[in-house]
């Protein structure tokens, strides 16, 4: 058992047909010795009395808000909270496992350039008595300081017959240097609360490894005089860290067509500009990464060739 | 060329080699597009290797100051990782394809850090730790962990470069 | 010199299982990922499965998911195809092959057995 | 997954001609990650080409391999008799897959 928070209990128990389970001691927060009595959430029922209680926790029945009393006045409250191990594997069952990049990954985060800010998103299909708080660090054996705001419910979907949750946070690394070269990954800890469940989940990465720049702004087509070209140009996100002679893009351009199916031509430039063939009822479309690290391309920013 | 004594490095043959060394190392470690056939294992084996860190002076304030003690940092690291494609760590089995992107990488760091240092001119190197696996599967994974690092170092290298021929070129 | 030689191949019913082994010689074999492809007669080369050099990383064709499991003994240098509820479109010649490194994970197929014949037939 | 379309299906040629034999990839595969391999009747393939352009050990210089993004060639300057056979290409950059084959056969 440990502490969560203040008044606040994590029992790890393993979880298996007819396990033993966890025998925990509460005691109450009072300097009173006597005539105290022990209750469970809402029932009346007393289960002890005493300024410890003993009691065998093995499963969420025996988890909830125990309450210590005299006298009718409540004296403290001690809330335990289960987090699962099923074949020595905690429990997962908070979180939708979004297998992005790969199977497992419950936490995704990214960042908009170098500045040490990020944001993290996670899944979900649970809408009710959930609470999630976030912390992070630089490191894990010396930590240095990272800030995370609170998680907020960002988006609501339909996935077939059921509702899927999207909560993000977004943090900021206290003393970032954007030149630098990372050699500690940033740590990002979630912990899951669901009713009595408890669950945590990790994330380890380098924020050049999450980098996810926006879409190229201005985005503007200038037609050439007799001629099928029409020359695009762009400008560089205004999120995008500076200068840009050190901090530098790489471009894709694309022309393409209505149909899916079309074949795409593609042309890949460090500049700002570029010549294309504009088809007609074509799109033409541009996106961004960093020019000396592959990280994830941006989104596309489009506009129609006519 | 960069030497002791402060003269400029040609800032632009660096941009391009260094953008071409981030090329390389991409190629030689792509990270995406295909199967992960390393094995999983200790992470602690890289952590020697050489960081542009923040106090190195190669952000574009501590460029304009005095560019060479992070032209000092990066030549640093482009012999360490030389000497590192150039061991036993690569060239023992599994051997690689002849024509493996490891190989162009290995001449390019030679080449970038002779540009940054003529002969007849020493700055000091950092000792290579012995990184030397008893295991042909450790060295795969050695090569991984290498290559991984050796992309982050050059992308700082390559921005360095690229700043410099932008803004102090003569 | 390098060497695979694959054996094990045979007639076979429908349902039923087989294992196919490669022995391996003239190479580092632990250090290697190693293939199975398959070539049903007179067609081309479909990809079966690869395990990496120390087993513990496995893929398989869609396939011949959930019925096939690739496996190696690196101290008996021999790589293993346990084939289960084989099915008439199984039928093909399965050659092992070995991965040569092209980048620091993957590459081109670099040797080949010359192949052991599986026919699924009632 | 990528889909790998070689044409011509077949190929008929005499010794001494250029041969050119071209691999379509369904979507962009890195120039590093394209192998092609030869394949006799009654024998396994051998590799004659990796990164799309490098010649594997052993292989006569009248192999050549070029392309990127999508399009490959795989060029033989002046067939010789033993050249003729089944040529397949292959990516091995996003899983594993090979083309339908061209058979090269003596005009």
């Known amino acids: 058992i440990w502490e969560l928070k203040k008044d606040v209990y994590v029992v790890e128990l393993d979880w298996y047909p007819d396990a033993p389970g966890e025998m925990v001691v509460l005691t109450c927060d009072t300097p009173e010795e006597d005539g105290i009595t022990w209750t469970l959430d809402q029932s009346s029922e007393v289960l002890g009395s005493g300024k410890t209680l003993t009691i065998q926790v093995k499963e969420f029945g025996d988890a909830g808000q125990y309450t210590c009393h005299k006298g009718g006045e409540v004296l403290s409250h001690s809330l335990l909270l289960l987090h699962k191990k099923e074949d020595g594997i905690w429990s997962t069952d908070i979180l939708k496992d979004q297998k992005e990049p790969k199977n497992k990954t419950f936490l995704r985060c990214e960042a908009k350039n170098y500045s040490g800010r990020f944001t993290c998103w996670w899944l979900t299909t649970i809408s009710t008595d959930l609470t999630f708080s976030v912390k992070s660090s630089r490191g894990s054996s010396d930590p240095q300081g990272v800030t995370c705001g609170a998680a907020t419910l960002s988006a609501e979907r339909v996935r077939g017959d059921n509702k899927e949750y999207e909560y993000s946070v977004e943090c900021q690394e206290d003393s970032a240097c954007p030149a630098a070269e990372e050699s500690l990954p940033i740590e990002v800890m979630v912990d899951a609360v669901h009713k009595l469940k408890y669950e945590n989940y990790t994330s380890s990465f380098f924020i050049r490894d999450i980098i996810k720049p926006d879409p190229p702004k201005n985005l503007q087509l200038k037609p050439l005089k007799n001629s099928r070209q029409v020359e695009v140009s762009w400008e560089y996100p205004d999120t995008w860290s500076t200068p840009h002679s050190y901090f530098s893009l790489t471009f894709c351009v694309q022309v393409q067509g209505k149909s899916k199916r079309e074949k795409k031509d593609r042309v890949f430039t460090d500049k700002t500009s570029a010549t294309v063939i504009c088809r007609k009822n074509a799109s033409i479309s541009v996106r961004a990464q960093d020019r000396y690290y592959s990280s994830s391309w941006s989104e596309w920013a489009s506009v129609p060739c006519s | 060329r960069a030497v002791p004594g402060g003269s400029s490095p040609a800032w632009t043959q660096c941009q391009q080699l260094s953008q071409k060394l981030c090329t390389l190392a991409w190629s030689a470690h792509p990270l995406v597009g295909h199967m992960d056939l390393r094995e999983e294992g200790d992470e602690e084996t890289t952590n020697d290797v050489p960081h542009i860190q923040c106090g190195d002076g190669c952000d574009p304030q501590g460029l304009r100051d005095n560019s060479q003690f992070c032209l000092q940092r990066i030549h640093q690291g482009l012999i360490f990782y030389e000497k590192l494609l150039g061991s036993d760590i690569f060239t023992g089995e599994p051997s690689l394809l002849p024509d493996s992107p490891v190989g162009q990488l290995h001449a390019s760091l030679l080449g970038l850090s002779q540009l940054l240092q003529p002969e007849g001119h020493h700055w000091e190197t950092q000792q290579i730790p012995s990184l030397s696996p008893s295991q042909p599967w450790q060295r795969l994974l050695l090569r991984f962990k290498i290559l991984r690092s050796l992309q982050a170092f050059v992308a700082v290298a390559a921005r360095v470069f690229a700043h410099g021929a932008a803004t102090l070129s003569p | 010199q390098v060497q695979l030689v694959e054996s094990g191949g045979g007639v076979v019913q429908p349902g039923r299982s087989l294992r196919l082994s490669c022995a391996a010689s003239?190479?580092?074999?632990?250090?290697?990922?190693m293939h199975w492809v398959r070539q049903a007669p007179g067609k081309g080369l479909e990809w079966v499965a690869v395990?990496?050099?120390?087993?513990?990383?496995?893929y398989y064709a869609d396939s011949v998911k959930g019925r096939f499991t690739i496996s190696r003994d690196n101290s008996k240098n021999t790589l293993y195809l346990q084939m289960n509820s084989l099915r008439a479109e199984d039928t093909a010649v399965y050659y092992c092959?070995?991965?040569?490194?092209?980048?620091?994970?993957?590459?081109?197929?670099?040797?080949w057995g010359q192949g052991t014949l599986v026919t699924v037939s009632s | 997954e990528i889909v790998l379309t070689q044409s011509p299906g077949t190929l008929s040629l005499s010794p001494g001609e250029r041969a050119t034999l071209s691999c379509r990839a369904s979507?962009?595969?890195?120039?590093?990650?394209l192998a092609w391999y030869q394949q006799k009747p009654g024998q396994a393939p051998r590799l004659l080409i990796y990164?799309?352009?490098s010649r594997a050990t052993g292989i006569p210089d009248r192999f050549s391999g070029s392309g990127s993004g999508t399009d490959f060639t795989l060029t033989i300057s002046r067939l010789e008799p033993e050249d003729f056979a089944v040529y397949y290409c292959?990516?091995?950059?996003?899983?594993?897959?090979f083309g339908q084959g061209t058979k090269l056969e003596i005009k």
């Open positions: 092959a070995r991965m040569g490194y092209y980048d620091i994970l993957t590459g081109p197929f670099d040797y």
């Open positions: 292959q990516q091995y950059g996003s899983s594993y897959t």
């Open positions: 990164g799309a352009s």
């Open positions: 979507q962009s595969v890195s120039s590093s990650y």
């Open positions: 395990i990496s050099y120390g087993g513990s990383k496995k």
């Open positions: 003239g190479f580092s074999f632990s250090s290697y990922a």
